[in-house]
């Protein structure tokens, strides 16, 4: 987790002088509780947005937006703590909005936004906005939390972000797999424009099961420049096992930008349809 660039982040708006500060996620009001605290945020919304760094790289960011409740507690609102928690790693990053002037009611509901938390493809987050100061130990909570799921690099908008392109998202191998006679599979795919090797991983399964009955790995050497974007054809020999008929072919590239961690593409060949077995004819004809 990180913030997009380190340029000056602003939270000021007409009628409010505000500054964005780094936060330890442990606001002072936890340690020194106040008697009067503001109510919780209203209508917290998290959306996937995309933003360029000063270097021109494109990153997915969490766009956080919320409004204030129209009650008198607005008079005691000194700011907000924004926290993003990556659910799997338990890594948390916080920033603090510090209000440098008192809020006053005006004709429109106060609305705040922040779009500088960089998020990772295919990751899950919990976003929390805490109004400051935080409540006394037994006080009503004054925060709101929402979960946020970032799509993976297959997602159209994600595909062109810097982290996805670094893992090979622009390569479309257009895999085709056909079953040949004599227990063979012909795998065909389009090579990318990089002189790097590939690996084909074949896993076979029985018709209705998820336990593999055959596994095979095939190495494809790095293509020459004249072979870039051309089709590569490979014939794989299957083990002659009855019922081991569902085949998953996975192609793993080793691009220089992602090495062992590049996006893999796969295709599956289903078992052939079994013809419906005819009803057995009874040995005798019933009389009714």
């Amino acid at each position: 987790l990180r913030l997009l660039d380190h340029r000056a982040l602003v939270c000021s708006q007409p009628g409010l002088n505000c500054t964005v500060k780094n936060s330890t996620c442990l606001d002072d009001s936890w340690i020194h509780p106040r008697n009067l605290t503001p109510s919780s945020p209203k209508d917290l919304q998290i959306q996937l947005h995309f933003a360029h760094t000063q270097q021109g790289d494109l990153f997915p960011v969490a766009h956080i937006e919320w409004t204030l409740q129209t009650d008198a507690s607005i008079l005691y609102l000194e700011g907000a703590e924004l926290s993003v928690l990556q659910l799997n790693t338990n890594e948390r990053l916080c920033v603090r909005f510090e209000f440098l002037s008192k809020l006053r009611h005006h004709h429109r509901r106060w609305r705040f936004t922040f779009s500088h938390f960089v998020v990772d493809p295919d990751q899950e987050y919990e976003v929390t906005v805490h109004h400051l100061p935080k409540p006394i130990p037994d006080g009503d909570p004054n925060h709101q939390s929402k979960n946020f799921l970032v799509p993976d690099c297959e997602h159209a908008r994600m595909k062109v972000t810097t982290p996805c392109m670094s893992s090979g998202s622009l390569w479309d191998p257009n895999i085709t797999v056909e079953t040949l006679e004599a227990h063979q599979l012909r795998v065909s795919f389009t090579l990318w424009n990089e002189s790097t090797h590939y690996q084909i991983l074949l896993t076979s399964f029985p018709h209705m099961e998820n336990h593999s009955c055959f596994e095979h790995m095939h190495h494809i050497p790095a293509p020459r420049p004249e072979e870039f974007h051309q089709r590569s054809n490979v014939t794989l020999t299957l083990r002659n096992l009855k019922g081991c008929c569902r085949h998953q072919v996975q192609i793993q590239p080793f691009f220089s930008s992602c090495l062992n961690d590049c996006l893999r593409h796969s295709a599956t060949v289903s078992c052939p349809e079994m013809p419906d077995t005819p009803e057995p004819i009874p040995d005798y004809m019933p009389l009714w």
Partner: antibody, heavy 116, light 107 residues
């Protein structure tokens, strides 16, 4: 091929405990969380909680708080869910699933029958 | 907690026809909705998340429309393998909650 393979069916007496295992393969266990969901016979799905194998962090549904413990063993790529003080209404198929929000791969399920 | 309500409980459709399944949340969940398919004796399978993103390997005939509180799963042309029970699930806030399911059966 991502796979989650669960332990076999269990029959337990009321008041006993059950521990269901879920072995992950085809990916690194620490890359994603593991959620547990149960389904009573003929009923819908009920979320029980999740564990992060990376951090050990857990989140349990309030209904199961104090009665459920989720753990992982990264050396064997296995997640465990233990439910204590079993009652007859805990009879259900218990599923493990990958991830914490939208659950993309599921185990085959483990039927736990609680009967005296 | 957020209550998810699915309708109808059972939907009878002929193969090749369009099926429309409804899911309503008791409060706004933005686009934080997933759809699952479950066949008898099998575990659920993720179809759609983010209210509109198809999971890996899910055919284009499955699509979702909606955000906020009203969502619709559409199966444009039912195939024989699509007859199953479908569940919606919100992941906007804890606890995660599921709808009661819609059974799609052959007419």
């Amino acid at each position: 091929q991502v796979q989650l393979v669960q332990s076999g069916a269990e029959v337990k007496k009321p008041g006993a405990s059950v521990k269901v295992s879920c072995k992950a393969s085809g990916y690194t266990l620490t890359s994603y969380g593991i959620s547990w969901v149960r389904q009573a016979p003929g009923q819908g799905l009920e979320w029980m909680g999740w564990i992060s194998a990376y951090s050990g962090n857990t989140k349990y549904a309030q209904k199961f708080q104090g009665r459920v413990t989720m753990t992982t063993d990264t050396s064997t790529s296995t997640a465990y869910m233990e439910l204590r003080s079993l009652r007859s209404d805990d009879t259900a198929v218990y599923y493990c699933a990958r991830r914490q929000l939208a659950l993309d791969y599921w185990g085959q399920g483990t039927l736990v029958t609680v009967s005296s | 907690e957020i209550v998810m309500t699915q309708s109808p409980a059972t939907l009878s459709v002929s193969p090749g026809e369009r099926a429309t399944l409804s899911c309503r949340a008791s409060q706004s969940i933005s686009s934080n909705l997933a759809w699952y398919q479950q066949k008898p004796g099998q575990a659920p399978r993720l179809l759609i998340y983010g209210a509109s993103t198809r999971a890996t390997g899910i055919p284009a005939r499955f699509s979702d429309n909606g955000s906020g509180t009203e969502f619709t799963l559409t199966i444009s042309s039912l195939q024989s393998e699509d007859f199953a029970v479908y569940f919606c699930q919100q992941y906007d806030t804890w606890p995660l909650t599921f709808g009661g399911g819609t059974k799609v059966e052959i007419k």
